[in-house]
């Protein structure tokens, strides 16, 4: 049989039987609209461990009645089909008998054989239909079983829920009782608090009087203090003058045993003088007319580091000109650039190493360290000289080792067809434009990806990741 779905009547099933030259189409009854077909998505009929979909209480009995009705229909159809075939056979036999006179015995035998095979085919088809009916019956029986199981489960759940509701009722009454108790306690506490408040007010009145008396005493002390301050300033001036005299003329102390200690050239000197707390210190740099306040890092890798650059919060604008990068800007207690002139002067005193501390927005820390670091003078565009790279911020150096000149927005000394300092912002030793720029724009978390002009250290976080914080610091090689 050739089963198909008709697009017009998609609810009906057609059984087409080819018999000799004739074709008979029997329209078999389908489930009517009330019988719910279960789809794979909705409910798997063979998966007994799953709950069946919710059904009305009398649906199973309806299904059984319907099944009986369908069975009766099928039986009627089968009888009709049998009668039809028998009738058909009679008429064909008559025709064969008429033709027998004219035809040979051999032909008759052939027709007989053909009829027999056709009869066998019809019988096989009938068996198929019967099998289909039986299959459907067994499927419905399984569904029925599942439904009864599901009903049992639901009843069980209902009982459980009823028990839970009872428990909740009990808890509720307990809570009500506790609330009443708490209300009583609350009233008592309020009365106590009122008493305490009155006591405190009395205390405040007494303390106000005491404070007024103390203020009077403080004013007297302040007057005395200003006199002391004046004296202290005079002493300080005297000490400074003495220090300067000792430094300039190499005066020997009375004992003649040791030279007066020289002022600190860098944070390494500060550390070696016994100051091992990180903070701001004043250093005296060779050939610089004024002392310079710097931040000294006394914690990292043995301490003694002079911080020359620091970024942490984006509070300071680093998109500045040549003069500002030359003399420095910002505050050593926060974000700042020490100044190229000072970096040049310090690194000309003795051999220095450079350490760069980095942190990304995920809290990962890394560093790059260089065994040798110094920069050229202004005429040389503060050219960068580095040797011996190590550290955790990438195997490759993100600073140009072969010597790059310093560029700012108003001084284009890079190797690019572009103006790196303008495009990437900030002053830096740009190449073309190179794998780093710690003086770029500060971008906050979430905004720090895909940035052309951010705080970049290529071999740590890639070419377009803007870092959270950076610190550049130097220390003498012989520390």
């Amino acid at each position: 049989s050739n089963q198909r779905r008709s697009p017009e009547n998609s609810g009906r099933r057609y059984n087409r039987i080819q018999h000799g030259q004739c074709a008979y189409t029997f329209i078999l009854p389908e489930h009517d609209g009330n019988c719910r077909e279960s789809t794979t998505d909705q409910y798997n009929t063979n998966a007994l461990q799953r709950d069946a979909p919710h059904v009305e209480p009398d649906f199973s009995s309806q299904k059984l009645q319907h099944l009986e009705h369908v069975m009766e229909n099928y039986t009627q159809w089968l009888q009709k089909l049998e009668n039809y075939i028998v009738e058909n056979m009679k008429s064909e036999m008559a025709q064969i008998q008429q033709n027998a006179v004219q035809n040979h015995t051999a032909t008759m035998l052939e027709i007989g054989t053909s009829l027999l095979s056709q009869t066998a085919e019809q019988t096989r088809k009938l068996t198929d239909v019967e099998t289909q009916v039986l299959n459907q019956t067994s499927r419905l029986e399984i569904q029925l079983l599942e439904n009864s199981l599901s009903t049992y489960k639901l009843e069980k759940q209902l009982l459980q829920q009823t028990n839970e509701i009872l428990k909740i009722h009990e808890k509720n009454s307990l809570l009500e009782h506790k609330i009443l108790e708490m209300e009583g306690k609350h009233k008592e506490e309020l009365d106590t608090l009122k008493e305490e408040k009155e006591n405190l007010q009395g205390l405040v009145t007494r303390q106000t009087y005491i404070i007024q008396e103390l203020e009077k005493q403080l004013n007297r002390a302040t007057t005395n203090n200003s006199v002391l301050q004046k004296q202290q300033l005079e002493l300080m001036d005297t000490v400074h003058n003495l220090v300067n005299l000792c430094t300039k003329e190499g005066v020997l102390l009375k004992g003649g045993k040791r030279e007066e200690e020289k002022p600190f050239r860098d944070c390494a000197d500060v550390y070696q003088a016994g100051f091992n707390k990180s903070g701001i210190y004043t250093i005296y740099i060779n050939n610089m007319p004024e002392p310079k306040k710097v931040f000294c890092n006394m914690d990292v890798n043995g301490g003694g580091w002079t911080v020359i650059q620091h970024r942490e919060d984006g509070s300071l604008d680093f998109q500045r000109g040549w003069k500002e990068y030359k003399m420095g800007f910002g505050n050593p207690s926060g974000e700042y650039w020490l100044g190229n002139e000072f970096i040049f002067a310090i690194t000309s005193q003795r051999q220095y190493m450079l350490r760069i501390e980095l942190m990304d927005w995920e809290g990962n820390r890394a560093y790059s360290q260089y065994d040798r670091f110094h920069i050229g003078n202004e005429k040389q565009n503060y050219r960068l000289y580095l040797k011996g790279h190590t550290g955790t911020a990438g195997k490759q150096s993100s600073l140009i080792l072969h010597g790059a000149d310093f560029s700012t927005k108003d001084a284009d000394n890079d190797n690019c067809m572009c103006k790196c300092a303008l495009m990437l912002t900030g002053g830096w030793w740009f190449d073309a434009c190179g794998p780093s720029n710690l003086n770029g724009m500060f971008y906050t978390a979430g905004q720090n990806h895909g940035k052309l002009n951010g705080i970049k250290w290529h071999y740590f976080k890639g070419p377009s990741y803007s870092l959270r914080s950076t610190t550049m610091m130097i220390r003498p090689l012989d520390f």
Epitope: Q396, I400, H402, N415, C416, M417, C418, M423, L424, D431, A432, C433, G434, P435, G450, K451, L452, H458, G462, P463, S464
Partner: antibody, heavy 122, light 112 residues
């Protein structure tokens, strides 16, 4: 001096192979993405292939995919283009070009080689 | 692929006069980071192309200030305030926002 010097062009028969080289100097070659761009006689510019600074990312134009291979040797500051199964339509002047910036988006070709002519003819 | 369309394809100009070339892209070239990755190149006869303008409006080093670039999104313009004899050649626009990079067909600038 910052420059790109090309070599390896010439006349080749269809179906044969050719390897182009591009030697970089005067800049940190390992920091920049590199490209090959070609120009057929009397025609416009056509991008051919790209390789990232580390060599981990590679792209090809559909017209050369499966036939051309781009590679680089950062230790030797060199870029290469291996051209196999050459066709008549591959006839062009081939340029190596360097990204303008050390960045993961093409910001332009800041530097070009002098170009080398590849002629595919029987 | 992004299609870059230049106009005009041929531009005869008298020296000292201004010139303008338009470049349109089939999709916006404005990247999420705020940049338009569009460049202008000049290829003089018998030479390699050279960068004139990058990121839409930034003049490359050594490029005379008579050249300027403008535009955003899909419409870009290259202007030459006063054309000189040395400006002859083919001008190409190129986008790098979307892969693969694509060039315009070129505009041939010639002196009248």
């Amino acid at each position: 001096e910052v420059q790109l010097v090309q070599s390896g062009g010439g006349v080749v028969q269809p179906g044969r192979s050719l390897r182009l080289s591009c030697a970089a100097s005067g800049f940190t070659f390992s920091s920049y993405g590199m490209h090959w761009v070609r120009q057929a006689p009397g025609k416009g510019l056509e991008w051919v292939s790209y390789i990232s600074s580390s060599g981990s990312t590679i792209y090809y134009a559909d017209s050369v995919k499966g036939r051309f291979t781009i590679s680089r040797d950062n230790a030797k500051n060199s870029l290469y283009l291996q051209m196999n199964s050459l066709r008549a339509e591959d006839t062009a002047v081939y340029y190596c070009a360097r990204d303008l910036l050390d960045y993961d988006i093409l910001t332009g070709y800041g530097m070009w080689g002098q170009g080398t002519l590849v002629t595919v003819s029987s | 692929d992004i299609v870059m369309t230049q106009s005009p394809l041929s531009l005869p100009v008298t020296p000292g006069e201004p010139a303008s070339i338009s470049c349109r892209s089939s999709q916006s070239l404005l990247h999420s980071n705020g940049y338009n990755f569009l460049d202008w190149y000049l290829q003089k006869p018998g030479q390699s192309p050279q960068l004139l303008i990058y990121l839409g409006s930034n003049r490359a080093s050594g490029v005379p200030d008579r050249f300027s670039g403008s535009g955003s999104g899909t419409d870009f313009t290259l202007k030459i305030s006063r054309v000189e004899a040395e400006d002859v050649g083919v001008y190409y626009c190129m986008q790098g926002t979307h892969w693969p990079p694509t060039f315009g067909q070129g505009t041939k600038l010639e002196i009248k």
